[in-house]
């Protein structure tokens, strides 16, 4: 009876996500067979989050809308380890929007999910950000410095990275 009600709950939860994510890849969390964490297929997973590299080129606003439709946001990077994971899936000759912007042009950078901007956990290329007109952040590769962040004009189409919390069923 307990297993039956657990299965019913899981199925109803899966139905919630089905309109955006018809297929989920789930793994057992820990030793308890009851707990599964899932990411949409073919998203990748790291710690408690799922990531999707969008190769369509769109402006920052359209990229964020695109992530939002999938129940996600443009990526918020909280640690060096998280960035190191993300860059494994990026192409060196491309740039990708982050969920970081300065819409007022006052160098008040803000993350899309309202995570406080912490200057100590940022990975700007040297000399960046360097232009008050450039109000959106990308991650890209520079041969001298490897992967880092740069400020660019928000309306210039780029690839992007979406991030969402893992789905627990």
């Amino acid at each position: 009876n307990f297993m039956y009600s657990k299965t019913v709950k899981r199925l109803s939860k899966l139905r919630e996500y089905q309109q955006y994510h018809p297929s989920l890849t789930c793994v057992m969390e820990g030793k308890d067979i009851e707990d599964w964490s899932c990411c949409p297929t073919p998203w990748t997973s790291f710690q408690s989050s799922c990531y999707f590299i969008s190769t369509g080129m769109q402006s920052w606003t359209k990229s964020q809308k695109n992530c939002s439709v999938m129940g996600a946001d443009l990526v918020v990077i909280n640690t060096r380890e998280e960035q190191d994971f993300i860059i494994q899936n990026l192409k060196r000759n491309s740039s990708y929007f982050l969920g970081l912007s300065d819409p007022g042009g006052r160098r008040h950078w803000q993350w899309v999910d309202q995570t406080p901007y912490n200057e100590n956990v940022t990975f700007w290329h040297s000399g960046e950000p360097n232009n008050l007109d450039e109000r959106c952040a990308i991650i890209n590769f520079r041969s001298s410095e490897e992967w880092g962040w740069n400020d660019i004009h928000c309306h210039v189409p780029q690839k992007s990275i979406c991030k969402m919390k893992k789905i627990y069923i």
Partner: antibody, heavy 121, light 111 residues
Framework: EVQLLESGGGLVQPGGSLRLSCAAS????????MSWVRQAPGKRLEWVAT????????YYPDSVKGRFTISRDNSKNTLYLQMNSLRAEDTAVYYC??????????????WGQGTTVTVSS | DIVMTQSPDSLAVSLGERATINCKAS??????????VNWYQQKPGQPPKLLIY???NLESGVPDRFSGSGSGTDFTLTISSLQAEDVAVYYC?????????FGGGTKVEIK
């Protein structure tokens, strides 16, 4: 008073090259993102190129990418547009304009009087 | 690319009367409460002049008979009381995504 003065237009044969200049005064040129916009006879305005204040980022529509190059010399308060492999459809009045950000978008707030480019054999 | 479609192509209005110009974007140009549409006025032999930015914000120095409205995909420029000096071609433009694109223009004349 802001003044933008374009020069360098003229008649050129298809396949030829031309370099347009835009001399700016009345603004702190080195702090402005700048753009070129063109208008073919009887046609709508068309954005051609943008360069950020430091000159390290440039942007173009597909119609001119690989043929046109925007650049600037902040010490001379001058914006340039190098146009190569010119085609008949590049015939237009070319305007330089200052770019002003508006949240995630922008506006083109000051415009020059324009210089005419005619591509014809 | 985002296509901006203006209507009508031309408009004849009596002095002191209202002129209304419409602009439709092929996709939404809104984000977070702002619309990325600008309006420009171009008189014969002159460069365009910025009138309205962000769909409804009046540019400094522009007479307040000009106003803009709209959101999403549908935008309007209104001249509340047409003056002789308003005879011009008016263009809408989106700045939400490169390439920036302009409408085909609406020619405003006096009836």
């Amino acid at each position: 008073e802001v003044q933008l003065l374009e020069s360098g237009g003229g008649l050129v044969q298809p396949g030829g090259s031309l370099r347009l200049s835009c001399a700016a005064s009345g603004i702190t040129f080195s702090t402005y993102t700048m753009s070129w916009v063109r208008q073919a006879p009887g046609k709508r305005l068309e954005w051609v190129a943008t360069i950020n204040s430091g000159g390290d980022n440039t942007y173009y529509p597909d119609s001119v990418k690989g043929r046109f190059t925007i650049s600037r010399d902040n010490s001379k308060n001058t914006l340039y547009l190098q146009m190569n492999s010119l085609r008949a459809e590049d015939t237009a009045v070319y305007y330089c304009a200052t770019y002003r950000p508006y949240y995630y978008g922008s506006v083109l707030d000051y415009w020059g009087q324009g210089t005419t480019v005619t591509v014809s054999s | 690319d985002i296509v901006m479609t203006q209507s009508p192509d031309s408009l004849a209005v009596s002095l002191g009367e209202r002129a209304t110009i419409n602009c439709k974007a092929s996709q939404s140009v809104d984000y977070d409460g702002n619309s990325y549409v600008n309006w420009y006025q171009q008189k014969p032999g002159q460069p365009p002049k910025l009138l309205i930015y962000g769909a409804s914000n009046l540019e400094s120095g522009v007479p307040d008979r000009f106003s803009g409205s709209g959101s999403g995909t549908d935008f309007t420029l209104t001249i509340s009381s047409l003056q002789a000096e308003d005879v011009a071609v008016y263009y809408c433009q989106q700045s939400d995504e490169d390439p920036w694109t302009f409408g085909g223009g609406t020619k405003v004349e006096i009836k």
